[in-house]
C-alpha cells in the first residue's frame, strides 16, 4: 500500500504520458487521477512503466472500480492485464470478442496462465456457449485449448463451431473428450462428399463407434496407421479382417509393426488365424483354426 500524501505543486498529471515514468510510487498515487487513468488506459501500453509503477496504477483502478472494471477499461488494459489476479477477473463482465483478443495478445507466446483461464471462463459463460468465432480465437492463441475442457464443457460446443477446429487442436484430447466431439463433427460435416468428409472427420475418429468405422471401410478412405492406432479399442474389436483391410487400404502393411500395441494387439486376438493369414503379413495370435468362438455377450442378451 502506498501512503496517502499530497501531490507536490506542479506535479498533478494532466494526461497519461511518459513523464510519469519519472514519478516515484507515492507521487503516482498522489498525482494521477484514477478517472483520467481510466479514460487514457490505451496510453499505458506505450509507456515503459516499471512493474512497481504498474502496481500503483492498478491500485488506483481498483479503488475507482471496486465492483470490477468496465469493459471500456478492460479492453485497453494491455500489459497491465498481467498484473490482474483471477479474483480481479472474476468481477469482470467481458462480452466483446475484441476485448478477449486484445488481452490474449498480451499473453501471446506464454503458457495459459490462471488469469487467462479465468478470463476465458468468464467470457464463455457470458456467451452461454463456445461459438465458432470464440473457438477460432481461442485455438489460434492456444492450440490445446479444446482438450483442456471437460466433456461436460465440450457438450456446450455447437456443431457449427467444429469447422474452426484444426487437427493439432485435438492432439492432447483423451477418448472421453473425443466421444463428445465426434458426434458434433459428424453432424457438422455430414453434407460433404466421401473423400472431403474423411479429411475433416479424421482427427475426430478417436470417438467413432464401430458402425461408423464399418461404413468408412466401404468408402476407400485409406486410413493411415497413426489414425487407426487412436481409434477406440471397443470400436475396432468387432471389425472383420476384410473390413480393416478395406479401411486401411495400402496402409494395412503397417499392422505388422503395431501388432504388439493396442488396439491392433487386442483386435488380432479376436480374429481367426486363417483370416489374418489372408493378409500375408505374418500376424500371429489369432484364434486357431477349428476353434469355436462363443460370443457370451450375445448369449446373455438373448436369455
Amino acid at each position: 500500500e502506498v501512503e496517502k500524501t499530497a501531490c507536490p505543486s506542479g506535479k498533478k498529471a494532466r494526461e497519461i504520458d511518459e513523464s510519469l515514468i519519472f514519478y516515484k510510487k507515492w507521487e503516482l498515487e498522489a498525482c494521477v487521477d484514477a478517472a483520467l487513468l481510466a479514460t487514457q488506459m490505451d496510453r499505458v501500453n506505450a509507456i515503459p512503466f516499471t512493474y512497481e509503477q504498474l502496481d500503483v496504477l492498478k491500485h488506483k483502478l481498483d479503488e475507482l472500480y471496486p465492483q470490477g472494471y468496465p469493459e471500456s477499461v478492460i479492453q485497453h488494459l494491455g500489459y497491465l492485464f498481467l498484473k490482474m489476479s483471477p479474483e480481479d477477473i472474476r468481477k469482470w463482465n467481458v462480452t466483446s470478442l475484441e476485448t478477449l483478443k486484445a488481452l490474449l495478445e498480451v499473453n501471446k507466446g506464454h503458457e495459459m496462465s490462471p488469469q487467462v483461464a479465468t478470463l476465458i471462463d468468464r467470457f464463455v459463460k457470458g456467451r452461454g456457449q463456445l461459438d465458432k468465432d470464440t473457438l477460432d480465437t481461442l485455438t489460434a492463441f492456444y492450440p490445446g485449448y479444446l482438450c483442456s475442457l471437460s466433456p461436460e464443457e465440450l457438450s456446450s460446443v455447437p456443431p457449427s463451431s467444429i469447422w474452426a477446429v484444426r487437427p493439432q487442436d485435438l492432439d492432447t484430447c483423451d477418448p472421453r473428450q473425443l466421444d463428445v466431439l465426434y458426434p458434433k463433427a459428424r453432424l457438422a460435416f455430414q453434407n460433404m462428399n466421401g473423400s472431403e468428409y474423411f479429411v475433416k472427420i479424421q482427427s475426430f475418429l478417436g470417438g467413432a463407434p464401430t458402425e461408423d468405422l464399418k461404413a468408412l471401410s466401404q468408402q476407400n478412405v485409406s486410413m493411415d496407421l497413426a489414425t487407426f492406432m487412436k481409434l477406440r479399442t471397443d470400436a475396432v474389436l468387432p471389425l472383420t479382417v476384410a473390413e480393416v483391410q478395406k479401411l486401411l487400404g495400402p496402409h494395412v502393411e503397417g499392422l505388422k509393426a503395431e501388432e504388439r500395441h493396442r488396439p491392433v494387439r487386442d483386435w488380432i486376438l479376436r480374429q481367426r488365424q486363417d483370416d489374418l493369414d489372408t493378409l500375408g503379413l505374418g500376424l500371429q495370435g489369432g484364434i486357431p483354426n477349428g476353434y469355436l468362438v462363443l460370443d457370451l455377450s450375445m448369449q446373455e442378451a438373448l436369455s
Epitope: 515503459p48 512503466f49 516499471t50
Partner: nanobody, 111 residues
C-alpha cells in the same frame, strides 16, 4: 533486452550504456532507462519514443545524460557525462509497445 557498457568510473567521468534487443525489433517500442541503487526504489532516468523524436529526462540527470536510438542496430544508448557518486546504481532498460521487455541491468559505480 541486454544492457552493456557499465563499469567503474571516477566522478566527472563518462560512460555510454547500450540496450540491445534480440528476437524482436525495437523500432515499434518506446524505451525507458531506469536505475536502482541498493536499498532504494527503482527510478526512471530517461525516455525515448519509438520514433526517436521525443525524449525526456529525470530532473536529476537533465543536461548530463543523453538518450538516443539506432534502429538499424536495434539498440538504444544512454550517454552519461559528468557522473556523480549518487549516479551509482544498476541501470536497466525497458521496452513498451505491444509487449513489455526488461533487461537484467548493468552496474555503474561512480567512485
Amino acid at each position: 533486452l541486454v544492457e552493456s557498457g557499465g563499469g567503474l568510473v571516477q566522478p566527472g567521468g563518462s560512460l555510454r550504456l547500450s540496450c540491445a534487443a534480440s528476437g524482436f525489433t525495437l523500432d515499434y517500442y518506446a524505451i525507458g532507462w531506469f536505475r536502482q541503487a541498493p536499498g532504494k526504489e527503482r527510478e526512471g532516468v530517461s525516455y525515448i519514443s519509438s520514433s526517436g523524436d521525443s525524449t525526456n529526462y529525470a530532473d536529476s540527470v537533465k543536461g548530463r545524460f543523453t538518450i538516443s536510438r539506432d534502429n538499424a542496430k536495434n539498440t538504444v544508448y544512454l550517454q552519461m557525462n559528468s557522473l556523480k557518486p549518487e549516479d551509482t546504481a544498476v541501470y536497466s532498460c525497458a521496452a513498451a509497445g505491444g509487449f513489455r521487455y526488461w533487461g537484467q541491468g548493468t552496474l555503474v559505480t561512480v567512485s
